[in-house]
Amino acid sequence: NSYYDKVLAHSRIRGRDQGPNVCALQQILGTKKKYFSSCKNWYQGAICGKKTTVLYECCPGYMRMEGMKGCPAVMPIDHVYGTLGIVGATTTQHYSDVSKLREEIEGKGSYTYFAPSNEAWENLDSDIRRGLENNVNVELLNALHSHMVNKRMLTKDLKHGMVIPSMYNNLGLFINHYPNGVVTVNCARVIHGNQIATNGVVHVIDRVLTQIGTSIQDFLEAEDDLSSFRAAAITSDLLESLGRDGHFTLFAPTNEAFEKLPRGVLERIMGDKVASEALMKYHILNTLQCSEAITGGAVFETMEGNTIEIGCEGDSISINGIKMVNKKDIVTKNGVIHLIDEVLIPDSAKQVIELAGKQQTTFTDLVAQLGLASSLKPDGEYTLLAPVNNAFSDDTLSMDQRLLKLILQNHILKVKVGLSDLYNGQILETIGGKQLRVFVYRTAICIENSCMVRGSKQGRNGAIHIFREIIQPAEKSLHDKLRQDKRFSIFLSLLEAADLKDLLTQPGDWTLFAPTNDAFKGMTSEERELLIGDKNALQNIILYHLTPGVYIGKGFEPGVTNILKTTQGSKIYLKGVNETLLVNELKSKESDIMTTNGVIHVVDKLLYPADIPVGNDQLLELLNKLIKYIQIKFVRGSTFKEIPMTVYRPAMTKIQIEGDPDFRLIKEGETVTEVIHGEPVIKKYTKIIDGVPVEITEKQTREERIITGPEIKYTRISTGGGETGETLQKFLQKEVSKVTKFIEGGDGHLFEDEEIKRLLQGDTPAKKIPANKRVQGPRRRSREGRSQ
């Protein structure tokens, strides 16, 4: 079934209460426009945003009988000429008579007649109509023949994109058959289709078809009011392509539209081949879109690649929500032209600062006021991380200008990074030299403390991403952050007692649920000693508050529980509800405190792994005093398992080199590549592809290269655990930019800068160590439990 037939069937269903063969039509209030009712229009009770009234009429081909419900009688079948009268196209019938077409369409043959309605003839330009009436034997006859096809074609045969030769000089009739059931012929809508005749079929259309001999290019070249667009099309080498065969829709901005553009914008775009071509292509669709087919908002891909939304408000057509079409449906032999009074500028032709919307004006105004806009060169590449207007508090806005400038610099990157280029663990450098971390979650992407909202765009010289908050790069480690806040003094002392201070100082990615002193309310000094006395218990409790990976509260999908594995080994349950983070159903007092090696979420209760029993009465009593949200299990005699701290402690002990490294003499400025052979490393990371996070597994080759420079340095690497104290000679030269560790039982990862610095110490020339020795470094944490 064709779209037309489907919509007709829906209209029939909606009208069946009124009797047999009744169709429900919707008429736009204040107009004579009627449409068979589609499901969408029926429920909306509107077409093109205008209210409709429901009319019940006989479905095509049926008629009423006196005293009977509905339309029980079938319309009489007649030849095409007689059928024109049956469907009420009496003006077309009269013209067919006077032009001597009558005998043709009463006689032998099979015809399709696209018959203009009486109203269509009334709407025709009076000069054109007079011209036809003054020359009925030639001009009128030719005009009527151009509405006819030499065979019977029902709506099901009128396929989208078809060009049918008419009976006048084989001039093409452009058929479009849209999913909303609208069928058009040279953009005239079929308002009553499929009226079968003995020698063909009649379709009533809503306007008189004018002869088409020109292409879009021809029209542009002839129309003075489109000279700006024409010139721009020439500049962009596009004018000739609009003369080729196709089914284009051109939204052609008039000269007046170009006059509305700020001159500077026009001068920049016209001076940039890529931008001017994008601008022009953004006005062209590769499909033919007649105005009559637009009954609601729909998105169309332009030749430029981005989309435009075409909608309607009554008789007006809107583009991207703005009413701007002032002349519709200029049909040419390769498409249709709609004249518009605004120039459409695609994102790809805009400067990065122009990509900001109404919700980012505070940011863009500040960028301009503080002189940062001038540093965004048209031929450069940048990324703006633009916070929404309400992210800027009054306090922020009243800051010292120099401070404010530094804050803004944290929101501009030196390179163009699109949404699909972002991945978890990525480091981005700002124009101020600060480094920002990217965190990719299931339904969110965050940079430092701030998460993105919809609306990322790519422009000519950069990209823009929209953020909920001002981005604040971390300055301090987890340990330093806790130390500077008195609320965490008890937790910090316990941490140090458990020998875990280093863990929160060294580089890494952690999420710490930090209990405030309130969590230890009522704990006596004796009880504190009891807790400290059982180091395994203390470590288990503290490490239950620490999870590998950075989990930002705002990155959580609202209302969904995220199960993470803690460093202690048990699971912890996180949920974001109404801007609040719930940790094991306990409300976090403050969340997303960023640090250089992780994030802190503040809790005012001590957390405890529900699956771990306690075997000591006194400890149970203490824990029950502090922890109320769960029932702690008691199993007499059970002890806390020891958590091997080597897992988290950096320790360079052994190094494996299969075969000797090659060394050669190097000249000043030359780079040495030292090849260390080892096992392949499987690396996993998340990357956003087309807006969807995808986990990518990368297998690194057996050859890991250490890129080094010309200045020779010596590095002493001591072995531990009763080894013979052998070291490696000339291990690294100059500054190592990237070193890959091979870790037994873990995945390969890159050293942090701090680790590299620690490696590059010592100057004792060393003896060569035998092959097949291993580096037993810090075991890389598992990524299990990353459920965000």
């Epitope: 003075d224 009011d225 500049t235 170009f258 920049r268 001017s276």
Partner: antibody
């Protein structure tokens, strides 16, 4: 063919005003803007401003803001430029040019010499 | 004083190629297109090149324009005596919100 015909030469005293006309033919006047450019004797060109013949919108050079007014009369397809508070350094040949924006100043008038002298 | 800088004169013999240069800043040529105008002695200027390298119809292909960074140039190949004129470059200046011209280069055919 496109033609822009300007009014004749003027001699004015300092402090006076001058109004130069520019009659367009050979194209649809309201489809294009008009820019005014002046050239002091033996000097380069200086853009004075632009007017939309369709809407009457204007864009004046900062330097002349407050002293210059550009207008159009669509019924006669004529553009006008009035310069007030004339000074001796306003002595120049004043040109009107059709300004399509996309193709700037594609046709020029023959020029009007305005001499400001006491 | 002109915002765009042009060499005051250039010359060549018939048939030669002469290049006229025009230098600006990031707020004019660096950000926007360059247009070139020819002014024959005693006449009004005429548009020669627009949008850096586009020739209006009627302008011979002996004239070509190019732009790189904050400077632009006009090349006249196959120099003819009829090419003897003043040549002006022009661009929009974002900081001044004004259309600015170069000081002009007088091309002489020897």
């Amino acid at each position: 063919q496109v033609q822009l015909v300007q009014s004749g030469a003027e001699v004015k005293k300092p402090g006076a005003s001058v109004k130069v006309s520019c009659k367009a033919s050979g194209y649809t006047f309201t489809s294009y803007g008009i820019s005014w450019v002046r050239q002091a004797p033996g000097q380069g060109l200086e853009w004075m401003g632009w007017i939309s013949a369709y809407q009457g919108n204007t864009n004046y050079a900062q330097k002349l803001q407050g002293r210059v007014t550009m207008t159009t009369d669509t019924s006669t397809s004529t553009a006008y430029m009035e310069l007030r508070s004339l000074r001796s350094d306003d002595t120049a040949v004043y040109y009107c040019a059709r300004d399509m924006l996309v193709v700037p100043f594609d046709y020029w008038g023959q020029g009007t010499l305005v001499t400001v002298s006491s | 004083q002109s915002v765009l800088t042009q060499s005051s004169s250039a010359s060549g013999t018939p048939g030669q190629t002469v290049t006229v240069s025009c230098s600006g800043s990031s707020s004019d040529i660096g950000s926007n297109r360059v247009n070139w105008y020819q002014q024959l002695p005693g006449t009004a200027p005429k548009l020669l090149i627009y949008s850096n390298d586009q020739r209006p119809s009627g302008v011979p292909d002996r004239f070509s324009g190019s732009k790189s960074g904050t400077s632009a140039s006009l090349a006249i190949s196959g120099l003819q005596s009829a090419d003897e004129a003043d040549y002006y470059c022009a661009a929009w200046d974002d900081s001044l919100s004004t259309y600015v011209f170069g000081s002009g280069t007088k091309v002489t055919v020897l």
